[in-house]
């Protein structure tokens, strides 16, 4: 289950990385981000290390009401402040870790973080 | 080095209108929150207003609602506050505040003040 | 709106001393509380923010604690600086941010 969490962690940074430079990165985890309510990897500070991205700025995915703009020199109150990694791997080892049995190698760093059906699954839920 | 210079505070009647400006410099002015507090003689401080860096958020205290209105010009990197229909209770020393930049009500550069006196 | 309640309203001390001053707020604030000094006829100066976080340029014999509705402002030894006016505020629930009535701290 480490295991599974580091390499969870070491994807999500690698994307985080590819933002702005992806759009279908960037449209992955701002489906991310705002169904699973949080914001970077660790917490909404991870996007500052990113050195493409804007300063003073979170994407917009990151806000808890989403509008256009809403992540540029954003205030900490308005912003989902709990990171990625912790929330989503919880849900994964919760809902579909146990449920499919997913194996360690499947969570590889060139795979898919969560496939689109598990996304449509979280956000009906 | 940051500094926030306030002008504007005059004597004036009540009923009658007054603008207060704020000249900001040595800091990015356009990332920033700005705020108003004031101060009565004697007294503790009161938040009067507060706008977001791009103007899209504005709050104010309930004492002022309706008759005051914060703006900001971030070309001229400056904060306003029209003050219309002023009472004897908005006699007060009037503070520019800077937010913190994702904190944005927590003020952590403030003015010297100006002096705005009510009465007849 | 949330009050903001500083207690005492005013204390005497002498130099050396520890000195705690406390705020409390009417509903929780998280840790969305901040602490100001005030000398006569100066603006108002950052000391703490976010209950914990010292403002850069302030010294160390400055810390502040707490959380919820409880904060406490600690001078660890008091200096003749240090002399003046502290103030709370909240930045939790706005608008209005709301100030304590303020703690006037004297010379014993």
């Known amino acids: 289950r480490d295991k599974v969490m580091s390499e969870f962690n070491n994807n999500f940074r690698q994307q985080m990385e590819n933002y702005p430079k992806n759009n279908h990165t960037a449209s992955i985890l701002d489906r991310m981000q705002a169904d699973f309510k949080c914001c970077g990897a660790a917490n909404y500070t991870d996007w500052e290390k990113i050195p493409s991205m804007s300063k003073n700025r979170v994407p917009d995915s990151c806000c808890i009401n989403v509008t256009v703009g809403c992540g540029i020199n954003f205030n900490e109150k308005a912003i989902h402040k709990e990171g990625c990694v912790e929330k989503i791997g919880g849900w994964l080892r919760k809902n579909v870790l146990e449920q499919k049995l997913i194996s360690e190698e499947d969570l590889g760093g060139e795979q898919k973080l969560i496939s689109e059906e598990d996304l449509h699954h979280h956000h009906h839920h | 080095e940051v500094q926030l210079v306030e002008s504007g505070g005059a004597l004036v009647q009540p009923g009658r209108s007054l603008r207060l400006s704020c000249a900001a410099s040595g800091f990015t002015f356009d990332d920033y929150a700005m705020h108003w507090v004031r101060q009565a003689p004697g007294k503790g401080l009161e938040w009067v207003s507060g706008i977001s860096w791009n103007s899209g958020t504005m709050g104010y205290a309930d004492s002022v609602k309706g008759r005051f209105t914060i703006s900001r010009d971030n070309a001229k990197k400056s904060l306003y506050l029209q003050m219309n229909s002023l009472r004897a209770e908005d006699t007060a020393l009037y503070y520019c505040g800077k937010g913190l930049l994702h904190q944005w009500e927590v003020l952590d550069y403030w003015g010297q003040g100006t002096l705005v006196t009510v009465s007849s | 709106d949330i009050q903001m309640t500083q207690s005492p309203s005013s204390l005497s001390a002498s130099v050396g001393d520890r000195v705690t001053i406390t705020c409390r707020a009417s509903q929780s604030i998280s840790s969305y509380l901040n602490w100001y000094q005030q000398k006569p006829g100066k603006a108002p100066k950052l000391l703490i923010y976010?209950?914990?976080s010292l403002q850069s340029g302030v010294p160390s014999r400055f810390s502040g604690s707490g959380s919820g509705t409880d904060f406490t402002l600690t001078i660890s030894s008091l200096q003749p600086e240090d002399f003046a006016t502290y103030y709370c505020q909240q930045s939790y629930s706005t608008p209005p941010i709301t100030f304590g009535q303020g703690t006037r701290l004297e010379i014993k």
């Open positions: 976010a209950a914990s």
